[in-house]
């Protein structure tokens, strides 16, 4: 039975040209995390595999950095980066847990972080 929950940074905003950390955290389960996928809509950004390490999709190599931890850092943000991002935790024995983050990239300098929220 899947008992865990994914906590994410929720709805966040950042300035154009800046960078942002996408972070998820799996709690309330003793399941072992064996891989984490980061996707934007249906586009793979990166994978962190417990045995194989990090893999960044070639299309994003220049602007995506692994970490901190199982998170992902997006750099040189453009307005086109606005949208949904998903962390997909592959765990044993539970299966997969998915968290959603909405990023808004703003032209102005009043970008603020949204509240944290949980996805069961």
């Amino acid at each position: 039975m899947m008992t865990g929950t994914i906590e994410t940074t929720g709805n966040i905003s950042a300035e154009k040209g800046g960078s942002i950390i996408l972070q998820c955290h799996l709690s309330s389960t003793t399941a072992q995390v064996t891989q984490v996928n980061w996707e934007q809509q249906d586009q793979l950004l990166a994978i962190c595999n417990a045995d194989l390490g990090w893999h960044i999709s070639p299309s994003f190599k220049d602007r995506v950095a692994p970490g901190p931890g199982l998170g992902l850092t997006l750099q040189s943000l453009t307005v086109n980066d606005t949208g949904e991002y998903f962390c997909i935790y592959h765990t044993y024995p539970d299966g997969t847990y998915t968290g959603r983050i909405f990023l808004e990239v703003l032209e102005s300098s009043v970008a603020e972080h949204g509240a944290r929220f949980q996805i069961p």
């Epitope: 891989q35 996928n37 996707e39 809509q41 249906d42 586009q43 793979l44 994978i47 595999n49 194989l52 893999h55 999709s57 299309s59 998903f86 997909i88 592959h90 997969t96 998915t98």
Partner: antibody, heavy 117, light 107 residues
Framework: QVQLQQSDAELVKPGASVKISCKVS????????IHWMIQRPEQGLEWIGY????????KYNEKFKGKATLTADKSSSTAYMQLNSLTSEDSAVYFC??????????WGQGTTLTVSS | DIVMTQSHKFMSTSVGDRVSITCKAS??????VAWYQQKPGQSPKLLIY???YRFTGVPDRFTGSGSGTDFTFTISSVQAEDLAVYYC?????????FGAGTKLELR
């Protein structure tokens, strides 16, 4: 449980258009992308494209741009694929599938399209 | 586009046999590969995702392995109900692509 129910088989004439439906139940329609695949007789599967019902955004396989148009109706939790300028090459089974990241975990039963004069 | 090559269109087997189906990607897809089973007149059914993760309810005789460009799908002890066509699929980048399929048939 999650279900994707596709419309019945279609027999249409060359040059015509057809609209295939995929009605979902058992989950929130706007939470996942709906993808469409084609399977020609005795052949493998080919990806046509997807629609994200939450915002209506679409992505197509270049090969099917101009042939397929994907739409979604949130009120009825139904995804549609319109195929135009049909030829015998378009005779195939078409599948819709839900992509629960990062895989297609649930498929429709398939809709058989026959293009014949 | 990423081409997924399944070298065998047909594979003969007997009940109780161990059988492995291979799939090669034309470029590095890391672990972004799924395997589906399709029986005549039915829609495909997900068995394995992310190269080695068994989908919910899939019997443990089905396993997947590999990373990069070379992937293997194995049935440790073939049952009569396993006779079907098996497809690999990359979920690394669009357009999403499938292998041509490998049909498992009785020897």
């Amino acid at each position: 449980q999650v279900q994707l129910q596709q419309s019945d088989a279609e027999l249409v004439k060359p040059g015509a258009s057809v609209k295939i439906s995929c009605k979902v139940s058992g989950y929130t329609f706007t939470d996942h992308t709906i993808h469409w695949m084609i399977q020609r007789p005795e052949q493998g599967l080919e990806w046509i494209g997807y629609i994200y019902p939450r915002d209506g955004s679409t992505k197509y396989n270049e090969k099917f741009k101009g042939k397929a148009t994907l739409t979604a109706d949130k009120s009825s939790s139904t995804a549609y694929m319109q195929l135009n300028s049909l030829t015998s090459e378009d005779s195939a089974v078409y599948f819709c599938a839900r992509r629960a990241l990062p895989y297609f975990d649930c498929w429709g039963q398939g809709t058989t399209l026959t293009v014949s004069s | 586009d990423i081409v997924m090559t399944q070298s065998h269109k047909f594979m003969s087997t007997s009940v109780g046999d161990r059988v492995s189906i291979t799939c090669k990607a034309s470029q590095d897809v890391f672990t972004a590969v799924a395997w589906y089973q399709q029986k005549p007149g039915q829609s495909p059914k997900l068995l394995i995702y992310s190269a080695s993760y068994r989908f919910t309810g899939v019997p443990d005789r089905f396993t997947g392995s590999g990373s990069g460009t070379d992937f293997t799908f194995t049935i440790s002890s073939v049952q009569a109900e396993d006779l079907a066509v098996y497809y690999c699929q990359q979920h690394y980048s669009t357009p999403l692509t499938f292998g041509a399929g490998t049909k498992l048939e009785l020897r």
